[in-house]
Interface confidence: medium
């Protein structure tokens, strides 16, 4: 067990042009508070996933009103840290977000109205005991300075906070095969309490006899790295060829601890340990009121007049959660038609139309003629939310712009010539065919195919294409 | 212009059931929360609840759960109020009341004109 | 619930003078507070929030202060069209309007 302490140094403009507008005002005062969320490991999660280390919110800030005419300086912060309290051992890798949150007060608002100034994210190692580790993070304008370190709760010591001192018996040295508690100078490891051959590195215990695994560890005496990429089944016994060992359902599976609350296996059942705020056997409860500010991202808080009425948010459009702490992905409603792409840009859904269509949601199918003009004498052919064009002969392209080469595209069969001509191409057909395109075999006996040809035409003799 | 246009009068039997409505304009509708306010006897004025237009959540006055039922409409930005089971007690006047100037302000700022309700048989 | 006692229920003053009404909460509502006048016919009009800001548009004859659990909201130098009732709401934790105060001008 221990706790994780933050604490903010400052919070103001980032050095470079654009400077944020203070925001707060002669006739908007308002003040500050900050919300820190902890997860374990380093992965790559939401913003809205659970904050499963705990979460915390600090005090409000001192009332802050902009100077006219100053830049925005670095804002008054609360005092004191914010310290997030974990149970079971600090998983050494974490993933934390920082949320920088403005109080208005005043004139604009008739009780305080909060929003999001800035949010910070990073992931980082840190062992229990050390020192403080220094930060600076920035969020488009603003820069958050801070400071952050782990310590061990007495009885536990170690980076993990799974090693117990306790106090030493004899003045002068600790007792046989113990050592002393580094950098506890006055107190000696605790004797060995946990489950004989339980991993000092992977496995902690907070009974006698017990031997639970840190986040990625497991079997009996956390020795068996867990791995997913070999596991075949979900769930099973322990695979002698793969050395994988994957956990058979246990009371905490799936987290039944509600809002960010922990979850840790009793003999029995379960325990969750629950952030601030919340509390009931799954951290279903919440002890916060309306006063605390839970309503994330302007919703409105609505709670009842006694601490064990619930409050509400009614989130705004966007948003939802029971804190609206998530933003809605209202794109995977697919609501632009016809191929649009969406943009949500948090205040509003964007849909960028394909050519051919517009509206909101691109709804509109546009006459792909309307102001189209199909060059030469071609003709304007509407399909598929695109226009095009309908050459007249001897021209092609988008917009029959360009002239064509009319024997490109060989028209004459049966190995007869083509010859390009003004108005079109025309066909020099080799002995034995005739036709515009030399598509008709001349009979053996003179006669053809055909009626006869036109005046002045002898079948051999170029046909000309009109 | 922020506007809240409200149904006419009614008169209704004991027993009965009845929606009235308030249609919203000059604003995103399913940015504000819209609340229910009830005057009875030409004075009192009672919160019954408010539903939020973007999801249909609703909070109701613990005295109106059962006798309020709150929808909207979201394609007319229309709030409704369903008043169930009318008694002589709930003939009043019936405004809807917007906290909009500001961020998501909890006080009601934009009434509309009112909806006599009359009970008797 | 949170329930706000406003008093006098009706009052009755010259037109030039000055008359205030006072609303009680039965706890601390922590300056959450606004201040409406009402006409026949009319939707409530805001008047005044968060204890005393006065909304724009509003002349500064009105005025409000308190804190805690004890407010007041004051009218000076009355003119004809002051006459309407008047409501304080509390808005700390849902909402309850006061019992209404009638001013008539003698």
């Known amino acids: 067990a221990g706790v994780f302490e933050l604490q903010i140094h400052s919070f103001g403009p980032g050095p470079g042009p654009g400077a944020p507008r203070s925001p707060c005002s002669a006739r908007l005062p308002c003040r500050l508070f900050f919300r820190v969320c902890l997860k374990p490991g380093l992965s790559e999660e939401a913003a809205e996933s659970p904050c499963a280390l705990g979460a915390a919110l600090s005090a409000r800030g001192p009332v802050y009103t902009e100077q006219p005419g100053a830049p925005a300086p670095d804002l008054p912060l609360p005092d004191g840290l914010l310290q997030v309290p974990f149970r079971d051992a600090w998983p050494g890798t974490f993933s934390f977000i920082i949320e920088t949150w403005r109080e208005e007060l005043g004139d604009q608002i008739g009780g305080p109205a909060w929003s999001l100034l800035a949010r910070v994210a990073g992931r980082r190692r840190l062992a229990a005991g050390g020192p403080w580790a220094r930060d600076i993070q920035r969020a488009g304008a603003w820069e958050l300075r801070f400071s952050y370190r782990a310590r061990c709760e007495p009885p536990a010591v170690g980076t993990a906070c799974t090693r117990l001192c306790r106090p030493r018996s004899a003045p002068s040295r600790c007792g046989p095969g113990l050592r002393p508690c580094a950098p506890l100078e006055d107190e000696c490891e605790a004797p060995l309490v946990c489950r004989a051959g339980c991993s000092p590195e992977h496995g902690f215990c907070e009974q006698p006899g017990e031997c639970r695994c840190l986040e990625g560890w497991t079997g009996p005496l956390c020795t068996v790295p867990v791995s997913t990429s070999s596991c075949l089944s979900p769930r099973g016994p322990s695979s002698a060829t793969t050395g994988c060992l994957v956990p058979g359902p246990g009371p905490c599976d799936g987290n039944p601890c509600a809002n960010g609350g922990s979850c840790s296996e009793t003999p029995r059942s379960f325990e969750c340990t629950c952030p601030r705020g919340f509390y009931g056997l799954r951290c279903e409860v919440s002890g916060v009121t309306c006063a605390d500010g839970p309503c994330f991202n302007g919703g409105l808080c609505v709670g009842g007049a006694d601490p064990d009425s619930a409050y509400i948010c009614h989130c705004p459009p966007g948003f939802q959660g029971s804190n609206c702490e998530k933003r809605v992905d209202r794109c995977s409603l697919q609501p632009c038609r016809n191929g649009g792409l969406c943009l949500d840009l948090g205040h509003a859904l964007r849909c960028r139309c394909r050519a051919g269509f517009a509206g909101p949601r691109c709804e509109h199918d546009l006459d792909d003629c309307a102001g189209r003009a199909c060059a030469n004498g071609g003709t304007c052919v509407e399909g598929g939310g695109a226009h095009r064009c309908s050459c007249a002969l001897g021209f092609g392209g988008r917009d029959c712009r360009e002239r064509a080469d009319p024997c490109a595209a060989r028209p004459c069969a049966h190995g007869g010539r083509c010859y390009a001509h003004f108005s079109g191409l025309v066909c020099a057909c080799a002995p034995g065919y005739m036709g515009a395109r030399c598509e008709f075999p001349v009979h053996p006996d003179g006669a053809s195919a055909l009626p006869a040809a036109p005046p002045g035409l002898r079948p051999g003799d170029p046909q000309r294409y009109l | 212009e922020v506007q809240l246009q409200q149904s006419g009068p009614e008169l209704v039997k004991p027993g009965a059931s009845m929606k009235i409505s308030c249609k919203a304009s000059?604003?995103?509708?399913?940015?504000?929360?819209m609340n229910w306010v009830k005057q009875s006897h030409g004075k009192n004025l009672e919160w019954i609840g408010l539903?939020?237009?973007?999801?249909?959540?609703?909070t109701y006055n613990q005295k109106f759960k059962g006798k309020a039922t709150l929808t909207v409409d979201k394609s007319s930005s229309t709030a409704y109020m369903e008043l169930l089971s009318l008694t002589s007690e709930d003939s009043a006047v019936y405004y809807c009341?917007?906290?909009?100037?500001?961020?998501?302000?909890?006080?009601?700022?934009?009434w509309g004109a009112g909806t006599t309700v009359t009970v008797s048989s | 619930d949170i329930q706000m006692t406003q008093s006098p229920s009706s009052l009755s003053a010259s037109l030039g003078g000055k008359v205030t009404i006072t609303c009680k909460a039965s706890q601390d509502i922590k300056k959450y507070i606004a201040w409406y006048q009402h006409k026949p016919g009319k939707g409530p009009r805001l008047l005044i929030h968060?204890?005393?800001t006065l909304e724009p548009g509003i002349p500064s004859r009105f005025s409000g202060s308190g804190s805690g659990r004890d407010y007041s909201f004051s009218i000076s130098n009355l003119e004809p069209e002051d006459i309407a009732t008047y409501y304080c709401?509390?808005?700390?934790?849902?909402?309850?309007f006061g019992g209404g105060t009638k001013l008539e001008i003698k």
């Open positions: 539903i939020n237009p973007y999801n249909g959540g609703t």
């Open positions: 000059g604003y995103s509708f399913t940015g504000y929360t």
């Open positions: 009341a917007l906290g909009y100037y500001g961020n998501y302000r909890r006080y009601f700022d934009v």
């Open positions: 709401l509390q808005y700390d934790i849902l909402w309850t």
């Open positions: 968060y204890t005393s």
